[in-house]
């Protein structure tokens, strides 16, 4: 297949290609379907998935993906080497850790190889697309008769993450939540010993190292209170 790879020089698209509606008068008035949007997420800075809705194409099309980094030593155009598939049609690309450079502008180009001028070039800030793994190893310590401290671990640089703790008792209909900064610990100053508490935590790559909007999955819950083990009232480990 002959495909046109456009160079990452800031002028990725130099021809008057296809437009759906109003366009400058010098443009070719050729109407064609736009390519689907590419959405990328960086999972714990271990790998990145860039995906698109392959079913939005009018007929099954193996779209191709190329990428590069703007203004960097990594500005050479790269072909996707690990495609993701949906019903045997390309629907994404997975990049490995060594191919991820968080603080350089990531440029991704989706192209229809049967119609090479049908392409779309997007720019992304990867530091805003990091989703950490869920917090793990939740533990509860009884600091005093009525005070509990919740601790957890993350498989990432702790100072890069903020956290959201949710807790409720068996008597509650909804969760109470509390934001926690990078210190990954939470104290509940007033605990009712007659109630059973459930805690869970999720984390986000924000605000010190990036501005991600997406949270991790919730941790497995941990429980404390009247139904938990009486063997060691001062330390409770994770309960799945």
């Amino acid at each position: 297949l002959n495909t046109t790879i456009l160079t990452p020089n800031g002028n990725e698209d130099t021809t008057a290609d296809f437009f759906l509606t109003t366009m400058p008068t010098d443009s070719l008035s050729v109407s064609t379907l736009p390519l689907p949007e590419v959405q990328c997420f960086v999972f714990n800075v271990e790998y990145m998935n860039c995906t698109w809705n392959s079913s939005s194409e009018p007929q099954p099309t193996n779209l191709t993906l190329h990428y590069w980094y703007k203004n960097s030593d990594n500005d050479k155009v790269q072909k996707c080497s690990h495609y993701l598939f949906s019903e045997e049609i390309t629907s994404g690309c997975q990049l490995q850790k060594k191919e991820i450079h968080l603080y350089q502008t990531f440029v991704v180009q989706l192209q229809d190889p049967r119609e090479p001028r049908r392409q779309a070039t997007q720019m992304l800030k990867l530091q805003n697309l990091v989703i950490p793994w869920a917090p793990e190893n939740l533990t509860l310590h009884k600091l005093s008769e009525s005070q509990l401290e919740l601790n957890w671990n993350n498989r990432f640089l702790n100072h890069c993450l903020e956290h959201l703790v949710q807790y409720r008792t068996d008597w509650d209909h909804s969760w109470t939540e509390q934001s926690v900064d990078y210190r990954h610990k939470f104290s509940l100053p007033s605990v009712d010993g007659q109630k059973r508490y459930t805690f869970r935590v999720r984390s986000r790559f924000n605000p010190l190292c990036g501005s991600a909007q997406h949270w991790s999955e919730w941790s497995h819950p941990i429980h404390w209170g009247s139904n938990t083990s009486k063997e060691n009232p001062f330390l409770f480990a994770l309960e799945a």
Partner: nanobody, 126 residues
């Protein structure tokens, strides 16, 4: 359907500044990726700047550090503040929009945009 109208172009001396505006009607810009392009006489249209509706902004190498893209969703408008203008910035400047499902979508390819303004002339004299 979005209608876009640029304004703010004009004649300015090298080293000067201009602020281009792009007003939208017909639809809110709150879920529209926006871009600025320019076309100099006898040259092809080129990417200048773009933003996603989530707030990420991007620039062509030639304008990085001199131009600033901003948007005001309440006024349904986007802006391009152009500082330290040089004669090579002389062109017709177009704003463009593309409906975007994702807050991170920002396009540098002109064929990704479905809505275009008519353009405003910027002339930088030496």
């Amino acid at each position: 359907q979005v209608q876009l109208q640029e304004s703010g172009g004009g004649l300015v001396q090298a080293g000067g500044s201009l602020r281009l505006s792009c007003a939208a009607s017909g639809r809110t810009l709150s879920r529209v990726a926006m871009g600025w392009f320019r076309q100099a006489p006898g040259k092809e249209r080129e990417f200048v700047a773009a933003d996603s509706w989530g707030g990420d902004t991007f620039y062509a190498d030639s304008v990085e550090g001199r131009f600033t893209f901003s948007r005001d969703n309440a006024k349904n408008a986007v802006y391009l503040q152009m500082n330290s203008l040089q004669p090579e910035d002389t062109a017709v400047y177009f704003c463009a929009g593309a409906p975007a499902s994702f807050a991170t979508t920002a396009y540098s390819s002109s064929n990704s945009y479905s809505y275009w303004g008519q353009g405003t002339q910027v002339t930088v004299s030496s």
